[in-house]
């Protein structure tokens, strides 16, 4: 079953390469187990950036080596992606799956264009 | 008389606060005197950023204290805005006027969204 997912159109990464955005899914009821996946689309290729399954009311847990962290509140997931470089500029799509209880619901956002600018290197200290 | 003006939808300022974009106007004939104005729209307010009048084939000359510089080639104007800070993020609109010979033509672009990220300060050298 299809589900509406909202996310901001544009986000700027900080000069430290950190970008945060909210992914909100409009469910007709309260799910207990939710899976959130961040996909990156660039040059018509889609790759998975990170994913987490969480029980509503609990923290999102990404893999230890993931570049993503997040928190949830109701149907809103606050996602943070770190370690971004200018070459990572692209469309970051939020995919939400209601895993439990059945039936399964799937929602895919329109994507958040994340712009990343590499900082100028600091001058060497003498 | 109306005239079509094209400019990019989005530009990222460099970490040094410099943003460049091309403003191209589709003139029905060959003008000899052209005026280019950059307007900034933010929070429904429009302010003038800079302006220059130039003779085609010559350099654009902005005022000495202007944050803009530019070059022209045919019907294209290469504009550079410097000294930008994060608070200067906004929609920068290119306005082109064909001043001579008559008739007068006016064209206004859809605007270029310039995103600016302030750099992290470099650590103090001991």
């Amino acid at each position: 079953k299809a589900m509406h997912v909202a996310q901001p159109a544009v986000v700027l990464a900080s000069s430290r390469g950190i970008a945060s955005f909210v992914c909100e899914y409009a469910s007709p009821g309260k799910a207990t187990e939710v899976r959130v996946t961040v996909l990156r689309q660039a040059d018509s290729q889609v790759t998975e950036v990170c994913a987490a399954t969480y029980m509503t009311g609990n923290e999102l847990t990404f893999l230890d080596d993931s570049i993503c962290t997040g928190t949830s509140s109701g149907n809103q997931v606050n996602l943070t992606i770190q370690g971004l470089r200018a070459m990572d500029t692209g469309l970051y799509i939020c995919k939400v799956e209601l895993m439990y209880p059945p039936p399964y619901y799937l929602g895919i956002g329109n994507g958040t264009q994340i712009y990343v600018i590499d900082p100028e290197p600091c001058p060497d200290s003498d | 008389k109306a005239m079509h003006v094209a400019q990019p939808a989005v530009v990222l300022a460099s970490s040094r606060g410099i943003a460049s974009f091309v403003c191209e106007y589709a003139s029905p004939g060959k003008a000899t005197e052209v005026r280019v104005t950059v307007l900034r729209q933010a929070d429904s307010q429009v302010t003038e950023v800079c302006a220059a009048t130039y003779m085609t084939g010559n350099e654009l000359t902005f005022l000495d204290d202007s944050i803009c510089t530019g070059t022209s080639s045919g019907n294209q104007v290469n504009l550079t805005i410097q000294g930008l800070r994060a608070m200067d993020t906004g929609l920068y609109i290119c306005k082109v006027e064909l001043m001579y010979p008559p008739p007068y033509y006016l064209g206004i672009g859809n605007g270029t969204q310039i995103y600016v990220i302030d750099p992290e300060p470099c650590p103090d050298s001991d």
């Epitope: 409009a26 007709p28 009821g29 149907n75 209880p101 059945p102 | -």
Partner: antibody, heavy 119, light 106 residues
Framework: QVQLQESGPGLVKPSQTLSLTCAVS?????????WNWIRQPPGKGLEWMGY???????NYNPFLKNRITISRDTSKNQFSLKLSSVTAADTAVYYC????????????WGQGTLVTVSS | DIQLTQSPSSLSASVGDRVTITCKTS??????MAWYQQKPGKAPKLLIY???ILQPGVPSRFSGSGSGTDYTFTISSLQPEDIATYYC????????FGGGTKVEIK
């Protein structure tokens, strides 16, 4: 298309037990969703009574908890309501409806059946 | 328990008018708000869920908004077929309904 249909006696005597059944077609009640009973006294608003989930677990309105039982017959793809020790205040149109999740919006409803409590 | 206060309890408006109904909850419900239309002798019909999402087939003149404890249901241009009673429902904790708003034509 999912359809729900309530059935049961239209008249129940005070102190007796009200029994209604909701037959579901177009979707298996064990495949998903929660299956609810909602009632509406004449000229008044809607009151959620309780549900049975796809997995057989129940949740009831705390105000009715000691009088209500919702069960199911998976072989007939139907679920039932029993409300004990009824009084005239239980006179209402009784609806069955479906919602997603632990709590949720009711997307499919039965047409309702009027139950009058009177001697 | 979460209490819902729906207002007004009834209203009269002309065809083409903008109609607004509000629903206030006793605590933050995280946008878990639904709106229903009920015509006389019929079962309620789900119009909107999760505060603002229209059910398939529901006309776009119906809309919902809100967050926290304050929610609004709007009919942008009242039509004769919109004569009904409208109910809000929260589904953050239990399923509870507002008292209803009866909409009539002037």
């Amino acid at each position: 298309q999912v359809q729900l249909q309530e059935s049961g006696p239209g008249l129940v005597k005070p102190s007796q037990t009200l029994s209604l059944t909701c037959a579901v077609s177009g979707y298996s009640i064990t495949s998903g969703y929660s299956w609810n009973w909602i009632r509406q006294p004449p000229g008044k608003g809607l009151e959620w009574m309780g549900y049975i989930r796809f997995d057989g677990n129940n949740n009831y309105n705390p105000f009715l908890k000691n009088r209500i039982t919702i069960s199911r017959d998976t072989s007939k793809n139907q679920f039932s309501l029993k409300l004990s020790s009824v009084t005239a205040a239980d006179t209402a149109v009784y609806y069955c409806a479906r919602n997603y999740g632990t709590w949720g919006a009711m997307d499919f409803w039965g047409q309702g059946t009027l139950v009058t409590v009177s001697s | 328990d979460i209490q819902l206060t729906q207002s007004p309890s009834s209203l009269s408006a002309s065809v083409g008018d903008r109609v607004t109904i509000t629903c206030k909850t006793s605590q933050d419900i995280n946008k878990y708000m639904a709106w229903y239309q009920q015509k006389p002798g019929k079962a309620p019909k789900l119009l909107i869920y999760y505060t603002s999402i229209l059910q398939p087939g529901v006309p776009s003149r119906f809309s919902g908004s809100g967050s926290g404890t304050d929610y609004t249901f709007t009919i942008s241009s009242l039509q004769p077929e919109d004569i009904a009673t409208y109910y809000c429902q929260q589904y953050d904790n239990l399923n509870t309904f507002g008292g209803g708003t009866k909409v009539e034509i002037k």
